[in-house]
């Protein structure tokens, strides 16, 4: 039968590396076997790469194809082929489709004066244009309670929150992930980091108790918190 | 060391053919694009084609288009020039060059950075 | 196509003075900050021509760091310090950026 692209290709940059391109077809296709992307940047010598898609889903293919560090006059040609029969042709400028990495080594640490310092890092080394650009989301929920959330956007340059424990219920478990853009590329979000998870030990100021007996506290609430769910 | 000979130049009428070789060593010469340049007598350079590291991609300027195939055969580390419907303002000394790296992804480009000695065209009744 | 006008098109120089030689092409070949495809190279009687400058300001491997290259997008210069007699020669630039690639006419530096 007739190989159709029902969705067609969508594609991302993490501006990098790597350009992602996904893409849905009529029927269940087994994408590796009978697809190929072909993609050349438009640049004189240039040559024809060619990328051997997988499947996401039953009929939904994904192809990653390696890309030299990006820069904004990069336009790629790209063109999907089923065999001989080419199925759709199409151009791609990756400044122009950024997906940034997601933020790694998320940790929450107890800080001065009640807060917890949550410090990711930027997932772009120093040299590439992105690295400066990045702002982030950071979403703080409550395990045990669905409405318990809060998302703080990160506007300033150091991947870096502070939140000050007593805007967290007392005793209670909370989950922090944190994603990231780059507003001058006009970005999609990054996907969520892994989630970190800690308990927030907070007694209101008349209880007296110091810094230290509080963080002492939370480390061993911490330390049977997580003793229970390896166990369990 | 690298080297570039070219040969194949010689005494041709108007309207004949002819084929040009450029044989090189001492580089991967299948990753690099490959370029001919021609030097009429007393005038400038003058570019003429670019052929990619695998032979996929040739271009050429307005002035040999349709007459002139750039070529290459990387088992043999030769390059080609074929010249056909030769005409009187196509004599020149025909140089060789090494272009830009095309086995990455954007090119590498670092100019012509290594040129042959030349071969002479004559084209003449 | 891409036009390339090199002035001036013959140049005196004394040796140990500075040489100066400018390109400027009908379209800017800058394709990224850092990335001007602007060659310079040179040509003595008789022999190959061989590369000086690439990227506008890059030394191809081996010449000497009196030849320099500056500029962007569609204006660049090629300066010659302390000229010596060994420098006479036609002096052409070239954009690799679009096809058809093209040589400026050159510049014929003689020492006086």
């Known amino acids: 039968g007739s190989v159709k692209v029902l969705h067609e290709p969508s594609c991302f940059s993490d501006y990098i590396s790597t350009s992602v391109c996904q893409w849905k077809m009529d029927h269940p296709t087994n994408c590796s076997a009978e697809l190929r992307l072909s993609y050349q940047l438009d640049f004189m010598g240039s040559e024809n790469h060619t990328c051997v898609p997988e499947n996401r889903e039953d009929s939904v293919c994904v192809c990653s194809m390696p890309i030299d560090d990006a820069v904004e006059a990069d336009v790629y040609q790209l063109d999907l082929w089923a065999g001989q029969q080419l199925l759709w042709s199409g151009s791609f400028q990756p400044s122009k489709h950024v997906k940034p990495r997601t933020p790694g080594n998320l940790t929450v640490h107890p800080n001065i004066s009640h807060t917890w310092l949550l410090m990711w890092t930027n997932p772009y080394p120093t040299e590439n244009h992105l690295h400066s650009e990045l702002t982030y989301m950071v979403n703080v929920s409550n395990d045990n309670d669905p409405e318990d959330f809060k998302v703080y956007n990160v506007t300033y340059m150091g991947p870096t929150l502070r939140l000050a424990a007593s805007t967290l219920k007392s005793g209670a478990s909370y989950s922090a992930r944190v994603r990231a853009w780059a507003q001058t590329y006009n970005s999609t979000w990054s996907d969520w980091s892994p989630s970190t998870t800690w308990l927030n030990y907070y007694e209101p100021w008349e209880q007296h108790l110091g810094l230290n007996d509080i963080f002492e506290a939370q480390k061993i609430e911490w330390h049977e918190h997580h003793h229970h769910h390896h166990h369990h | 060391e690298v080297q570039l000979v070219e040969s194949g130049g010689d005494l041709v009428k108007p309207g004949g053919s002819l084929r040009l070789s450029c044989v090189a060593s001492g580089f991967p010469f299948r990753d690099y694009a490959m370029t001919w340049v021609r030097q009429a007598p007393g005038k400038g350079l003058q570019w003429l084609s670019l052929?990619?590291?695998?032979?996929?991609?040739?271009y050429y300027a307005d002035a040999v288009k349709g007459r002139f195939t750039i070529s290459r055969d990387n088992a043999k580390n030769t390059l080609y020039l074929q010249m056909n419907s030769l005409r009187a303002e196509d004599t020149a000394v025909y140089y060789c060059?090494?272009?830009?790296?095309?086995?990455?992804?954007?090119?590498?480009?670092?100019?012509?950075?290594?040129w042959g000695q030349g071969t002479l065209v004559t084209v003449s009744s | 196509d891409i036009v390339m006008t090199q002035t001036p098109l013959s140049l005196s120089v004394s040796p140990g003075e500075t040489a100066s030689i400018s390109c400027r092409s009908s379209q800017s070949l800058t394709y990224s900050i850092g990335y001007n495809y602007l060659d310079w190279y040179m040509q003595k009687p008789g022999q190959s021509p061989q590369g000086l400058i690439y990227?506008?300001?890059k030394r191809a491997s081996g010449v000497s760091d009196r030849f320099s290259g500056s500029g962007s997008g569609a204006d660049f210069t090629l300066k010659i310090s302390r000229v010596e007699a060994d420098d006479a020669g036609v002096y052409y630039c070239?954009?690799?950026?679009?096809?058809?690639?093209?040589f400026g006419q050159g510049t014929k530096l003689e020492i006086k």
């Open positions: 990227l506008g300001s």
């Open positions: 070239m954009q690799g950026l679009h096809s058809p690639l093209g």
């Open positions: 060059a090494v272009d830009r790296l095309t086995k990455t992804i954007r090119p590498q480009y670092y100019g012509l950075w290594h």
């Open positions: 052929i990619s590291g695998s032979g996929g991609k040739t």
